[in-house]
């Protein structure tokens, strides 16, 4: 099938990094500067992504692959292929419509992104608070008072936090 296709379509012989140039009798021409083709048999090359402004170049464009961007310091990537950059906040804050705002009492954020999450409720597991929570850290749950017999020490750290979606205020 491949041989038949190449007899019918000379463009299928053009490798990645080239395009099938209709203006030159379907000769395989190299992609022009600032363009690429990541697969063979292409009739055009794609324009390279430009990492401008808040975007920084993580990987330069080549004739066979697009440029890859990340975000300037103080920002982090969002979306497929870092399609957007979102500003960081400090730990103990969340990003809202009004900018970076401190976590309300009873909530925390230990990252520079994401939302403030409620402290773990130790009593739901029958445990007591061993270390109080802060804006930047969750509480640490310890054994319940009944468990505090001599020789017993079973400190349970909270489960690792997932990265939540935003819920701006």
């Amino acid at each position: 099938f491949e041989r038949t296709r190449s007899l019918q379509d000379p463009c299928s012989n053009c490798p990645a990094g080239t395009f099938c140039d209709n203006n030159r009798n379907q000769i395989c021409s190299p992609c022009p500067p600032n363009s690429f083709s990541s697969a063979g048999g292409q009739r055009t090359c794609d324009i390279c992504r430009q990492c401008k402004g808040v975007f920084r170049t993580r990987k330069e464009c080549s004739s066979t692959s697009n440029a890859e961007c990340d975000c300037t310091p103080g920002f982090h990537c969002l979306g497929a292929g870092c399609s957007m950059c979102e500003q960081d906040c400090k730990q103990g804050q969340e990003l809202t419509k009004k900018g970076c705002k401190d976590c309300c009492f009873g909530t925390f954020n230990d990252q520079k992104r994401g939302i403030c999450r409620p402290w773990t409720n130790c009593s739901l597991d029958g445990k007591s608070v061993l270390v109080n929570g802060t804006k930047e850290r969750d509480v640490v749950c310890g054994p319940s008072p009944a468990d505090l017999s001599p020789g017993a020490s079973s400190v349970t750290p909270p489960a690792p936090a997932r990265e939540p979606g935003h819920s701006p205020q």
Epitope: G53, V54, G79, S83, M84, C85, E86, L95, K97, G165
Partner: nanobody, 123 residues
Framework: EVQLVESGGGLVQPGGSLRLSCAAS????????MTWFRQAPGKGLEWVAH????????YYVDSVKGRFTISRDNAKNSLYLQMNSLRAEDTAVYYC????????????????WGQGTTVTVSS
């Protein structure tokens, strides 16, 4: 091509005023939140203000509240920043940026950025 072009920067004395403009092209301007950021010499980028598609919501960083006003003209595909009572600490390169799809609902990410216009406040 999607593009944002800022203008209106310059040298101004403390207490003076400037109006920055940002001309948008290549996309449906009226469908996006728009944002101003700034970068003072030797400092990181700082969010200044943003405005909803229909101008019904505007928000500012605390340091410019009462002095700066963000506005837009969707018919002219233009974003503005009126800057009054300027201070030396307002000296920076000012950038306009486009809020990405879902801005303010699920994130505050920007996806298009202008080249910037320089504002210098000095006597």
């Amino acid at each position: 091509e999607v593009q944002l072009v800022e203008s209106g920067g310059g040298l101004v004395q403390p207490g003076g005023s400037l109006r920055l403009s940002c001309a948008a092209s290549g996309f449906t301007f009226s469908s996006h939140w728009m944002t101003w950021f700034r970068q003072a010499p030797g400092k990181g980028l700082e969010w200044v203000a943003h405005i909803k598609e229909d101008e019904s919501e505007k928000y500012y960083v605390d340091s410019v509240k009462g002095r700066f006003t963000i506005s837009r003209d969707n018919a002219k595909n233009s974003l503005y920043l009126q800057m009054n009572s300027l201070r030396a600490e307002d000296t920076a390169v000012y950038y306009c940026a486009r809020g990405g799809e879902g801005y303010s609902i699920s994130h505050f990410g920007v996806d298009v950025w202008g080249q910037g216009t320089t504002v210098t406040v000095s006597s």
